[in-house]
Interface confidence: low
Amino acid sequence: GITIPRNPGCPNSEDKNFPRTVMVNLNIHNRNTNTNPKRSSDYYNRSTSPWNLHRNEDPERYPSVIWEAKCRHLGCINADGNVDYHMNSVPIQQEILVLRREPPHCPNSFRLEKILVSVGCTCVTPIVHHVA
Amino acid sequence: GITIPRNPGCPNSEDKNFPRTVMVNLNIHNRNTNTNPKRSSDYYNRSTSPWNLHRNEDPERYPSVIWEAKCRHLGCINADGNVDYHMNSVPIQQEILVLRREPPHCPNSFRLEKILVSVGCTCVTPIVHHVA
């Protein structure tokens, strides 16, 4: 990759090793200013693989609230509005970064954590295993 | 909410204000050990709203590589394998947290940033506006 010269105005760090402890400003910068927050708000209901959203709360995590998608059906909704079990509703999962308080209950010390969340559901053709 | 007593072993913090700077250990803890690695590997191809994945790289961000989904079609794939334009393929988007180097090019100083990524696509019934 490209080697970028270190900024001389960087804060000092005593620990030069990786894994390392870094300083993080929790004043979140939001790059999503041009997005319409309503745009995908009803996909969960209009999808052929609809899903429900469940609240997952953990005060020791930042962000403390994460919404998890759970597919409503094993099959997908067909043109008649019925569930077609020849197709499968499956969760689309994504790994996300969260901050975990470490040591526990500390307001100013965190560890980076990777968790798997279900973001929504999609309709897929099932894999059929043919027995010889 | 429940007030959790502060752990007496917490690191000291000089800045008690919010927005605040915190210490974060970048040694990522992975909570996803029980996931089946095959489970979602080919949904992008098998979905009725298939998508391609594009690499988004930014050395000033952590993680530096994020993969973005882009729906292949405006419509959805029907049972005959053709694109049905009476339905719409739409991206499922999620806001995720990343770390942005701040000041730029600093190895040990970051700011939390929220970005919107497309994780995959789902097939939805279109909203039809009838003109009076």
């Epitope: 689309i92 999962q93 798997l116 | 979602s40 992008y44 993680p63 590589v65 990524v117 994780v119």
Partner: nanobody, 119 residues
Framework: EVQLVESGGGLVQPGGSLRLSCAAS????????MYWVRQAPGKGLEWVAS????????YYVDSVKGRFTISRDNAKNSLYLQMNSLRAEDTAVYYC????????????WGQGTLVTVSS
């Protein structure tokens, strides 16, 4: 720190062969399914092949079946892709990836190795 380093790419004529290697470190290699994926110029990512932890199960995208063979050596923390009967449409940057290829959030990918098939 997870590291994946691919090698073995290069320029080859149609019908030729190449063997790609991926050296893994920073995680328990034998505990993860591994993947080869590729990205042709200006195109989206395409999954090519995957192999289970113990090498017992292998999967291939239809376009490479019978031509490509994925293998692994857990003792050496290495993943391989033997590519035979190469075609122009196999031209791409090839990446090895750890675990599932979705979601694609973490940079558990190498920088890739370029394979160019041209006469």
């Amino acid at each position: 720190e997870v590291q994946l380093v691919e090698s073995g790419g290069g320029l080859v004529q149609p019908g030729g062969s190449l063997r790609l290697s991926c050296a893994a470190s920073g995680f328990t290699f034998s505990s993860y399914g591994m993947y080869w994926v590729r990205q042709a110029p200006g195109k989206g990512l395409e999954w090519v092949a995957s192999i289970e932890q113990d090498g017992s199960e292998k999967y291939y995208v239809d376009s490479v079946k019978g031509r490509f063979t994925i293998s692994r050596d857990n003792a050496k923390n290495s993943l391989y892709l033997q590519m035979n009967s190469l075609r122009a449409e196999d031209t791409a940057v090839y990446y090895c990836a750890k675990g599932e290829i979705l979601p694609l959030y973490f940079d558990y990918w190498g920088q890739g190795t370029l394979v160019t098939v041209s006469s």
